[in-house]
Each structure stands twice: as structure tokens, then as C-alpha cells.
């Protein structure tokens, strides 16, 4: 089961994913893949991090624009198209056997609404899509008995479960973000 997020064609999509490094700065590898989380690793990797930084991106449209070093590994997909729709896997690769946290999020890309641009556009869109759309309880795609956990206390912060509607205001936020 996965949480759904909506973005308009041409805008930026934001797929939240985070963990709490413990102690601060003790980062773990993360991968984002197109497709639901598989048993191992990520399928169709779009972005991968190591213990220090992003080290693999399949396209310049994929970014981690949050504070990566504090565990915000939310994925931004720039200038989305209908082809970007689908399930994405965020996998937080906690050391140890079967300790990974796996989170499936679904991106729904819609065509821009044919409305006259107005200051109330974002409010109107938000009222049309009041909260998040979910297909069930979010969290790990499967429950597994973890092995002995290392010194990484993972508290996945329920992934900012608001439905994200992207309009031009997001572009302003993105333009001021630090690109890592």
C-alpha cells in the first residue's frame, strides 16, 4: 500500500521520505527507484546516496532538495510528465540483514486544469483535492523481523502525509533551495 501524491505536468513533484540519523551525521545509504520496493535494493534506480552524498542519478531531473545530512531524503522530480506517474520506492538501507526501511509512494501526474490563472489557483486546487489520497496504511511494504540494529535509531516521520499539490509557488521555493 502506498500514499498518493499529485503533481501537474510541467511542475515539480515532491515525494517525501526521511529518517533520523542517530547520532546526527551518521548517515545511511538510500536509494530511490521507479517501481514498488523489491526484496533487495531498488529496481530501476533513479537516485542513490551513500554515507556522504548523492552518488548516482539517472537524470538531472531527480534531486534531493531537503537537508540530506539531517535525513531528509525526499525526492524532487523536476518538470514532470505523464510518464513519471507510478509507484516509487524509497529504501533506507540500514546496515544489517533485513533491516532496510521500505516505503512505496505513488505519484499521480495530471494535466494542468484548464482554468484562467488567478491568485486563488492554489486554494482552488487544494479544495479540489482536500487531503492526501491513500490506498492503505503507509509504512514498510512488508513486515520483517529486524536483525540486531546498529547505532542508527530510525524514526521515519510518517512521511509528511499531506497531499502535495504543486503550483508556481513551489517553483519559488525550489529556486531558493540548496541543490545537493
Amino acid at each position: 500500500s502506498e500514499v498518493e501524491y499529485i503533481a501537474e505536468v510541467g511542475q515539480n513533484a515532491y515525494l517525501p521520505c526521511s529518517y533520523t540519523p542517530a547520532p546526527p551525521g551518521n548517515l545511511v545509504p538510500v536509494c530511490w527507484g521507479k517501481g514498488a520496493c523489491p526484496v533487495f535494493d531498488c529496481s530501476n534506480v533513479v537516485l542513490r546516496t551513500d554515507n556522504r552524498d548523492v552518488n548516482d542519478r539517472t537524470s538531472g531531473r531527480y534531486w534531493l532538495k531537503g537537508d540530506f545530512h539531517k535525513g531528509d531524503v525526499s525526492l524532487t522530480i523536476e518538470n514532470v510528465t505523464l510518464a513519471d506517474s507510478g509507484v516509487y520506492c524509497c529504501r533506507i538501507q540500514i546496515p544489517g540483514i533485513m533491516n532496510d526501511e521500505k516505503h512505496n509512494v505513488k505519484l499521480v501526474v495530471i494535466k494542468p486544469a484548464k482554468v484562467t490563472p488567478a491568485p486563488t489557483l492554489q486554494r482552488d486546487l487544494t479544495s479540489a483535492f482536500p487531503r492526501m489520497l491513500t490506498t492503505g496504511e503507509h509504512g514498510p511494504a512488508e513486515t520483517q523481523t529486524p536483525g540486531s540494529l546498529p547505532d542508527v535509531n530510525l524514526t521515519v516521520s510518517n512521511f509528511f502525509c499531506e497531499l502535495q499539490i504543486f503550483t508556481l509557488t513551489n517553483e519559488l521555493r525550489d529556486s531558493g533551495a540548496t541543490i545537493r
Partner: antibody, heavy 116, light 107 residues
């Protein structure tokens, strides 16, 4: 051409040991997950174990945990499966394969027969 | 563990015909499904992964579809070399599991 060639199979008595080898060529072996899959006579394929290259994480199906050990030697581009305390139900053709979730390509297989 | 059930167990067809093989998962595996072909005395060969993506070098007559629990492998026009054993495999849930196979034989 990507190629995997297994060796080391044979006849062994219950409780005995065998070490299977898989020689890889045609790709950068050290960057890929590698997997062992087996097929008992008349039975479906069964995933046995795999190893994450670099990180070294190793995963096993429950029925072989504590008895089988998967390993690699990147200098030799080789994958291994050390099989101890073998049982009759371990009789199968053992394949090595490249990949973590789906497998491509596969070796030709080596037959392991556990019988007294 | 996830049980993968393939049907039919045996499919008798003639060259040039369209073959449809089915695979059902005991619970949703999303699109995390692969198909393999195996000929007697040979290793399995990957045909499809991600439910519908053809592996490198696989002819266009092979196509995969489905999501969740129901999947299909279609061979649009059977060639003599297509008569073999076909397996599906899920890779969403631990452990990875395979179907029991469908034997495609010449009628």
C-alpha cells in the same frame, strides 16, 4: 559476452560438504549482486542465497541458513557456495545467476546429489 | 511466503498461434514479476522483468502484462524455438519465489 560457469557439484553423503564455484566473465563482477538458485528434480526453482557486492550483505532462504555460506572473490571473478551438513532434500541442480531481484544471465548449472 | 500459481500446467499449441500463459500471486506483488524460459538441459533465460519490460535480446513477440496478483505472458506468434517450460517469479516479498511452471508443447 557475459558468461557464468558453475563447477563443484557431485555425489555426497548426507551430512557431508561441497563447495560450488561460479566463474564470471564479460562484466564488472565486483559491482553486481550475485545469486544461487536451485532446482530439485521435478520441482520448481528455489532461490537459495545472494550476496551484495561491496557491502557484503548475505541473504539465505530459511532452509539453508546456518548450513550454506555464500561468498565471492573479486580478484578471481568468482562466486562460491559452501554447503555443509547436506541433506537429501538439497539434491538439485544449482545455478549461479547475476542480479538481486531478477536474474540475468544464469550459468548452465551443476548437479548436487546427496545420497547414501 | 508468497505462492505463485501458473496455469495451465501444460499448453498444447501449434506454431503461428498466440499463446497466453497465466501467473497468479497469493497476494499483491505490485509489478515486481519476472518471466523465464527454460529448455531441457539448459538454464533459465530471463524474458520479462517488471511485469512488462522485455529483457535484452528478447524478441518482440514476447510480452508481459498485469499487476498486483494477476499476470500474463503472451507469445504473439509461436515459433518452433518457443516450445519450452516457462516460469514466473515474484520479487516483492521475502523470500523470492517461483511458480511451478507451464509447459508449452507442440500440438
Amino acid at each position: 559476452e557475459v558468461q557464468l560457469v558453475e563447477s563443484g557439484g557431485g555425489l555426497v553423503q548426507p551430512g557431508g560438504s561441497l563447495r560450488l564455484s561460479c566463474a564470471a566473465s564479460g562484466f564488472t563482477f565486483s559491482t553486481y549482486w550475485m545469486t544461487w538458485v536451485r532446482q530439485a528434480p521435478g520441482k520448481r526453482l528455489e532461490w537459495v542465497a545472494n550476496i551484495k557486492q561491496g557491502g557484503g550483505d548475505k541473504y539465505y532462504v530459511d532452509s539453508v541458513k546456518g548450513r550454506f555460506t555464500i561468498s565471492t572473490d573479486n580478484a578471481k571473478n568468482s562466486l562460491y557456495l559452501q554447503m555443509n551438513s547436506l541433506r537429501a532434500e538439497d539434491t538439485a541442480v544449482y545455478y549461479c545467476a547475476r542480479g538481486s531481484n531478477w536474474f540475468d544471465p544464469w550459468g548452465q548449472g551443476t548437479l548436487v546429489t546427496v545420497s547414501s | 511466503e508468497i505462492v505463485m500459481t501458473q496455469s495451465p500446467a501444460t499448453l498444447s499449441m501449434s506454431p503461428g498461434e498466440r499463446a497466453t500463459l497465466s501467473c497468479r500471486a497469493s497476494q499483491s506483488v505490485y509489478d515486481n514479476l519476472a518471466w523465464y524460459q527454460q529448455k531441457p538441459g539448459q538454464a533459465p533465460r530471463l524474458l520479462i522483468y517488471g511485469a512488462s519490460t522485455r529483457a535484452t535480446g528478447i524478441p518482440a513477440r514476447f510480452s508481459g502484462s498485469g499487476s498486483g496478483t494477476e499476470f500474463t505472458l503472451t507469445i504473439s506468434s509461436l515459433q518452433s524455438e518457443d516450445f519450452a517450460l516457462y516460469y514466473c517469479q515474484q520479487y516483492t516479498h521475502w523470500p523470492i519465489t517461483f511458480g511451478q511452471g507451464t509447459r508449452l508443447e507442440i500440438k
